[in-house]
Interface confidence: low
């Protein structure tokens, strides 16, 4: 499958307008500071050299790997010492010590101003004036903020973002078509952004072995009437495109991507009877598709795992000849029979079986040891379980805001060093589980729950490796991938913190909180809070929810007032100060 | 972490201008707040002015209102002051300052790096 020009190849395979939409968005992942218009420009210069190698594949240059042409194109922007600082010393470096320097220097939080949603108008006169350079802008835009987003799906969301703008900007009302719209896909680019990072943090931090076990257990699930072999076959080919993804490889894996989804749906009557209605569309809408497919129903009579994996004289003979097909056709087997278990789950009983065969084919009577295997895993199904059958009570009791509060004091407890936005925002997004699963039956709860966690959990991870402030979310992040939620759930008040010292500026409040939206006040009054539990940790829930009520009355209060920020200044000290007495400040 | 450099100090008349620019350079995306403060020979540290990078939050001491203006560029990481219709009590050292929490505090001590100073001195 050599070609002469790999960059004719991929031109030639993806067609002009995905291979510059691609490089784009893969110049952006890297040089996350650039401006877009130096971006166009590079973007430009590679897709003209492209051409002439697709004209010409032995022209100069065209035998050099993807990696090089792109390294080399980027290291001639003239800023990159000073925008960059340490990154430039990557250009020092030959492939693939060059890319693999670039993908370190990536940033999961780049400081890059938020993106403020113009006025309609305005936005479908840039729309209407440059279609082109709108769509581009929205790619790069998304690309620098999101490093690791999943490329082939990005342009499926630019794909939907044009479709939104086309219809509602002929609308009668073009906000009300648009900006349900736009919201829509902020929220899913938001999700889509941060499942993608956990599958590149497991390949990237546990390696394809990991990735290729969560894989097994979830393509089981979704394909349950599929045999063993397809499965894995699967699981390989979706490993590589997302190594390719990760790795910044963002041409090939658009390409694989396509011809994996080619692939299923013309092999479809042996994978699942769920897909028909994907396979009939587009090429970007059948990927994200069979992406997102539901579950397959089960095979009938499906026999007794315990046969094959317990009562069989041949475990150990079976384990011992292939280790890892025998473990992946324990998760196959297991996961096909148990949509309703988190994938996370299904890897903890994969490793218990794992261990238990470990010891017990090395042991005098191997069967006799093994036997009560299935035992073990009752524990480790009860605790999700129980967990999520408390906090589904609790957010059914308290409602979204108050649950978010619940686990913000929660978590603040638990690793009081992380910075207050990053507590927030991982607060905030463990507290939405609350509404996206819990309204779920019990079958489908767990799947839902946890499997949303170990995302969440993940951004918590990344944003504290760049700038790491707490010995034990380092434990939790690189011990175990599927135990980083019980491990999270486990942690108990760190009882080694030192209270900070009580600053009443970080409670002193202005006019600006009254015009911001419900979201924006949601957050200062959360970031109010995480605060309030660092500078008293032993604070209880009855002391915490008394002054949280009594700022919610102050910013009521001063936002009616005619004179805001005199109420804000007055009422403020007056805050501050019953807050410290209700606190034992 | 986080280095500050001021530019932009010197001698002006009173009624004059001045422009002081901070740039910071490191690890600049914990960086919510950057501020001014300045100090005058036997005198404490006093806020000046501070604004919200990732927003557009400002806010001033009651002495130099109507007169400075601060401004950021969350994309370059810099923050600029404007000093117009200075006075000779605006003589001072001002220091750059960068916070990692988003409140605009007047408390020095809630700002975590500090630029080395710029000496302004406005003559009578």
């Known amino acids: 499958d050599a070609h002469k020009s790999e960059v004719a190849h991929r031109f030639k395979d993806l067609g002009e307008e995905n291979f510059k939409a691609l490089v784009l968005i893969a110049f952006a992942q890297y040089l996350q500071q650039c401006p877009f218009e130096d971006h166009v420009k590079l973007v430009n210069e590679v897709t003209e050299f492209a051409k002439t190698c697709v004209a010409d594949e032995s022209a100069e240059n065209c035998d050099k790997s993807l990696h090089t042409l792109f390294g080399d194109k980027l290291c001639t922007v003239a800023t990159l010492r000073e925008t960059y600082g340490e990154m430039a010393d990557c250009c020092a470096k030959q492939e693939p010590e060059r890319n693999e320097c670039f993908l370190q220097h990536k940033d999961d939080n780049p400081n890059l101003p938020r993106l403020v949603r113009p006025e309609v108008d305005v936005m479908c006169t840039a729309f209407h004036d440059n279609e082109e350079t709108f769509l581009k802008k929205y790619l790069y835009e998304i690309a620098r903020r999101h490093p690791y987003f999943y490329a082939p799906e990005l342009l499926f969301f630019a794909k939907r973002y044009k479709a939104a703008f086309t219809e509602c900007c002929q609308a009668a009302d073009k906000a009300a078509c648009l900006l349900p719209k736009l919201d829509e896909l902020r929220d899913e680019g938001k999700a889509s952004s941060a499942k993608q990072r956990l599958k590149c943090a497991s390949l990237q931090k546990f390696g394809e072995r990991a990735f290729k076990a969560w894989a097994v257990a979830r393509l089981s699930q979704r394909f349950p009437k599929a045999e063993f072999a397809e499965v894995s076959k699967l699981v390989t080919d979706l490993t590589k495109v997302h190594t390719e993804c990760c790795h910044g490889d963002l041409l090939e894996c658009a390409d694989d991507r396509a011809d994996l989804a080619k692939y299923i749906c013309e092999n479809q009557d042996s994978i699942s009877s769920k897909l028909k209605e994907c396979c009939e569309k587009p090429l970007l809408e059948k990927s994200h598709c069979i992406a997102e497919v539901e579950n397959d129903e089960m095979p009938a009579d499906l026999p007794s795992l315990a046969a094959d994996f317990v009562e069989s004289k041949d475990v150990c003979k079976n384990y011992a000849e292939a280790k890892d097909v025998f473990l992946g056709m324990f998760l196959y087997e297991y996961a096909r029979r148990h949509p309703d278990y988190s994938v996370v789950l299904l890897l903890r009983l994969a490793k218990t079986y794992e261990t238990t065969l470990e010891k017990c084919c090395a042991a005098a009577d191997p069967h006799e040891c093994y036997a009560k295997v299935f035992d073990e895993f009752k524990p480790l199904v009860e605790e999700p379980q129980n967990l999520i059958k408390q906090n589904c009570e609790l957010f059914e009791q308290l409602g979204e805001y108050k649950f978010q509060n619940a686990l913000l004091v929660r978590y603040t407890k638990k690793v009081p060093q992380v910075s207050t936005p990053t507590l927030v925002e991982v607060s905030r997004n463990l507290g939405k589980v609350g509404s996206k699963c819990c309204k779920h039956p019990e079958a489908k709860r767990m799947p839902c729950a946890e499997d949303y966690l170990s995302v969440v959990l993940n951004q918590l991870c990344v944003l504290h490796e760049k700038t790491p402030v707490s010995d034990r979310v380092t434990k939790c992040c690189t011990e175990s991938l599927v135990n980083r939620r019980p491990c999270f759930s486990a942690l108990e008040v760190d009882e080694t913190y030192v209270p900070k010292e009580f600053n009443a500026e970080t409670f002193t409040f202005h006019a600006d909180i009254c015009t911001l939206s419900e979201k924006e006040r949601q957050i200062k009054k959360q970031t109010a809070l995480v605060e309030l539990v660092k500078h008293k940790p032993k604070a209880t829930k009855e002391q915490l929810k008394a002054v949280m009520d009594d700022f919610a009355a102050f910013v009521e209060k001063c936002c009616k007032a005619d004179d805001k920020e005199t109420c804000f200044a007055e009422e403020g000290k007056k805050l501050v100060a019953a807050s410290q007495a209700a606190l034992g400040l | 972490q986080v280095q500050l450099v001021e530019s932009g100090g010197g001698l002006v008349q009173a009624g004059g201008s001045l422009r002081l620019s901070c740039a910071a350079s490191g690890r600049t995306f914990s960086i919510y707040d950057m501020g001014w403060f300045r100090q005058a020979p036997g005198k404490e540290r006093e806020f000046v002015a501070a604004t919200n990078l990732r927003g557009v939050s400002t806010r001033y001491a009651d002495s130099v209102k109507g007169r400075f203006t601060i401004s950021g560029d969350n994309a370059k990481n810099t923050v600029s002051l404007q000093m117009n219709s200075l006075i000779p009590e605006d003589t001072a050292v001002y220091y750059c300052?960068?916070?990692?929490?988003?409140?605009?505090?007047?408390?020095?001590?809630?700002?975590?790096?500090w630029g080395q100073g710029t000496q302004v001195t406005v003559s009578s």
């Open positions: 300052a960068a916070a990692v929490s988003n409140w605009l505090a007047k408390d020095p001590s809630a700002y975590s790096y």
